[in-house]
């Protein structure tokens, strides 16, 4: 089976507060079995952002439909982006089990935030 | 085996419009995004134009926004590129690609048809 | 923008890395094309991944902002023109090309 990557195309986005964010990360491979999560910052402060197998996250919404089971595209969308979520998101993936455990991560989206256009 | 094969190039005048086909076999079309990348005579490799796998979201190159149209018929297993106001600067080789899963990687390329504008 | 350096050569048989760098993508790709207007060829896709009908002299590696594409035993038929290219549609997906003259 082909060795799971997961690919965060850009190292930066750039939007403008009030408008929406798409971060975009794909992974290569279905195994291992286990979820997608997307977090804000990297280590113990890291904020979580999207969790597949939990919610509601009320800002966020994926780009593809993830419930699909062969589905790799786990790109989000975080709507009227403020000042607050400027920061390095990371997708990362899970590998199933009780707890779930990291796996693997990307390699990160910077998000800056521009001031509202006036 | 992959094949892509394009058609639809030619000669036409500044202004006018082509339509480039890309026939695609060996895969499962309706999975995958594809791509138009050309080549100007002398140049190097220019994206144009991606289109998603159910062919709702398309991506445009700033040099081509509102003039090329990127379409697909997954039941024919087939890509186009409308090309309408072409300019002299259009003159390229016009490249059909099959992106891999992430759609700015492609791994697989047609050889290409000629598109020349000129007066 | 992709940078890429305009040519590099290699002695027959000999090893030459041809660097990438710049952009705003977190992977790249490698294409090959053997002379202007033949199709290009991919040789890595997403950093390191080398599709099945390419040699394993071929190789790809990213660090940071740089990609690079290694060939190991270089043949006369490697001389061609080698491509980067970006992740991030930003970036106008293409480096300018590198031609590799095989001495």
């Known amino acids: 089976e082909e060795e799971l990557q997961i690919i965060q195309p850009d190292k930066s986005v750039s939007v403008a507060a009030g408008e929406s964010a798409i971060l975009h990360c794909t992974i290569t491979s279905l195994f291992p079995v286990g979820p997608i999560q997307w977090f804000r910052g990297a280590g113990p402060a890291r904020v979580l952002i999207y969790n597949q197998r939990q919610g509601p996250f009320p800002r966020v919404t994926t780009v593809s439909e993830t419930t699909k089971r062969e589905n790799m595209d786990f790109s989000i969308s975080i709507s009227n982006i403020t000042p607050a979520d400027a920061g390095t998101y990371y997708c990362i993936k899970f590998r199933k089990g009780s707890p779930d455990t990291e796996f693997k991560s990307g390699a990160g989206t910077e998000l800056s935030v521009r001031a509202k256009p006036s | 085996d992959v094949q892509l094969v394009e058609s639809g190039g030619g000669v036409v005048r500044p202004g006018e419009s082509l339509r480039l086909s890309c026939e695609a076999s060996?895969?499962?079309?309706?999975?995958?995004?594809m791509t138009w990348v050309r080549q100007a005579p002398g140049e190097g490799l220019e994206w144009v134009s991606t289109?998603?796998?159910?062919?709702?979201?398309?991506y445009y190159a700033d040099s081509v926004k509102g003039r090329f149209t990127i379409s697909r018929d997954n039941s024919k297993n087939s890509l186009y590129l409308q090309m309408n106001s072409l300019r002299a600067d259009d003159t390229a080789i016009y490249y059909c690609?099959?992106?891999?899963?992430?759609?700015?990687?492609?791994?697989?390329w047609g050889l290409g048809t000629l598109v020349t504008v000129s007066s | 923008a992709l940078t890429q350096p305009a040519s590099v050569s290699a002695n027959l048989g000999g090893t030459v890395e041809i660097t990438c760098s710049g952009g705003n993508s977190n992977h790249y790709g490698w294409y090959q094309q053997k002379s202007p207007g033949s199709a290009p060829v991919t040789l890595i896709y997403a950093d390191t991944n080398r599709p099945s009908n390419i040699p394993s002299r071929f190789s790809g590696s990213t660090s940071g902002s740089t990609t690079t594409l290694t060939i190991t035993g270089v043949q006369a038929e490697d001389e061609a023109v080698y491509y980067c290219?970006?992740?991030?549609?930003?970036?106008?997906?293409f480096g300018a090309g590198t031609t590799l003259t095989v001495l």
């Open positions: 290219g970006g992740s991030s549609t930003g970036d106008g997906i």
């Open positions: 289109i998603s796998d159910t062919g709702d979201t398309a």
């Open positions: 690609a099959k992106s891999w899963i992430w759609w700015t990687f492609f791994d697989y």
């Open positions: 060996g895969f499962t079309f309706r999975n995958y995004y």
